[in-house]
């Protein structure tokens, strides 16, 4: 009886948003299973997602240990199931992933406008500081905690009655903008890391408009 042929994984791809990081690959297994290993450039190969029929592996717990490190993963293929087998010959097939540096490459998740407050001709717009899965001293850090001043937000705002957009930028999570008295405005924000070469910007937040529940209007 002969040994079973396994197929090496291919199209290894990192999918990462706000440091939630999953390695995906092909093909869907037929009579084989996969085990993933992850390592830093200077570290040891650590096995994860043992003998799985999935074609993805959540590696968040590993990469959040140091988001500024560069990681490499590899996917091993093993014969499995009701297959003809005469024993394990040699090492299993494997394929390497591209390198991945979470701090530089994780996608910025869609931001959310937490609130806006009008006081006369000023509006304060606050962006929700989203929690990540990165930990320090057993607490989860926010996006701002992780990126600090590397992260800015761009605010797009316009009068409900027109389409001409204005922009503002902040390296905090708050904007203070001037508006015309008696006008309703709509807002959308985008997270940006200007120093990056890839994945610099998030998608735009959902649009929030004055006169809806999120806002607070105070006439002075």
């Amino acid at each position: 009886s002969g040994t079973t042929n396994t197929v090496a994984a291919y199209n290894l791809t990192w999918k990462s948003t706000n440091f939630k990081t999953i390695l995906e690959w092909e093909p869907k297994p037929v009579n084989q299973v996969y085990t993933v290993q992850i390592s830093t450039k200077s570290g040891d190969w650590k096995s994860k997602c043992f003998y799985t029929t999935d074609t993805e592996c959540d590696l968040t717990d590993e990469i959040v240990k140091d988001v500024k490190q560069t990681y490499l993963a590899r996917v091993f293929s093993y014969p499995a199931g009701n297959v003809e087998s005469t024993g394990s010959a040699g090492e299993p097939l494997y394929e390497n992933s591209p390198e991945f540096t979470p701090y530089l490459e994780t996608n910025l998740g869609q931001p959310t406008i937490q609130s806006f407050e009008q006081v006369g001709t000023k509006v304060n717009v606050t962006v929700e500081d989203e929690r990540t899965l990165v930990r320090r001293n057993n607490t989860f850090l926010s996006l701002r905690d992780v990126f600090g001043k590397d992260l800015i937000y761009t605010l797009y705002y316009w009068k409900s009655s027109s389409s001409g957009k204005k922009t503002a930028k902040t390296n905090t999570n708050e904007f203070l903008i001037d508006v015309d008295k008696g006008e309703n405005y709509c807002f959308s924000v985008q997270a940006v890391i200007p120093s990056r070469t890839v994945n610099r910007k998030s998608t735009d937040s959902p649009v929030e408009c004055m006169g809806q529940e999120k806002g607070e209007f105070r006439e002075i």
């Epitope: 299973v33 650590k46 003998y51 009701n82 003809e84 087998s85 394990s88 299993p92």
Partner: antibody, heavy 118, light 106 residues
């Protein structure tokens, strides 16, 4: 070749603690998960927990939380398991075992017999 | 946790006889592993991932199964096969072992 050499048999008093060791050779110690398994006399096998020596990451069977503590010393390529508040139920052979080709319990130490007796 | 029930608990076979032992899981599992253990020795991996023979295991052994029902078969019993065989799953945490099937030679 991969070898796991465990410490010798222990006779211990109820209520005390014991620390048994598993010295690894023939591979890069820090790169592989190490598992611990309990076998009571004439009975089956029970997974206690696991440790990854590379970063100290560990996981435990709920039944052994508070009973077993797993550690690893990279400098000596040795994994340790401490068992506390010993009772007669803890009298067993304890094995260390390492992941390998196609199996997470691929390589086994020779076992350490722990006898709890007054 | 997943309970694995092995049957029979004890069996004996004559040299040359075909032997089949089973392992039933309380819930469906993806794969089963089998170990051989002889007195005063450590368990040895015998069959991995349902049907893969571990290194050095004779070709007279085979493994099959899916879901909740798995089996180990020896096509022709030999004296050296007398041992206790344990099944094990790790589809769910914690990994669990069966109670064992003790195989004796007649």
């Amino acid at each position: 070749q991969v070898q796991l050499q465990q410490s010798g048999a222990e006779l211990v008093r109820p209520g005390s603690s014991v620390k048994i060791s598993c010295k690894a050779s023939g591979y890069t110690f820090s790169s592989y998960w190490m598992y611990w398994v309990k076998q009571r006399p004439g009975q089956g096998l029970e997974w206690i927990g696991q440790i990854y020596p590379g970063d100290g990451d560990s996981n435990y069977n709920e039944n052994f939380k508070g009973k077993a503590t797993l550690t690893a010393d990279k400098s000596s390529s040795t994994a340790y398991m401490q068992l506390s508040s010993l009772t007669s139920e803890d009298s067993a052979v304890y094995f260390c075992t390492r992941e390998g080709y196609g199996n997470r319990f691929a390589y086994w130490g020779q076992g350490t017999l722990v006898t709890v007796s007054a | 946790q997943i309970v694995l029930t092995q049957s029979p608990a004890l069996m004996s076979a004559s040299p040359g006889e075909k032997v089949t032992m089973t392992c039933s899981a309380s819930s469906s599992v993806s794969y089963m592993y089998w170990y051989q253990q002889k007195p005063r020795s450590s368990p040895k991996p015998w069959i991995n991932l349902t049907s893969n023979l571990a290194s050095g295991v004779p070709a007279r052994f085979s493994g099959r199964g899916s879901g909740t029902s798995y089996s180990l078969t020896i096509s022709s019993m030999e004296a050296e096969d007398a041992a206790t065989y344990y099944c094990q799953q790790w589809s769910y945490n914690p990994p669990t072992f069966g109670g064992g099937t003790k195989l004796e030679i007649k």
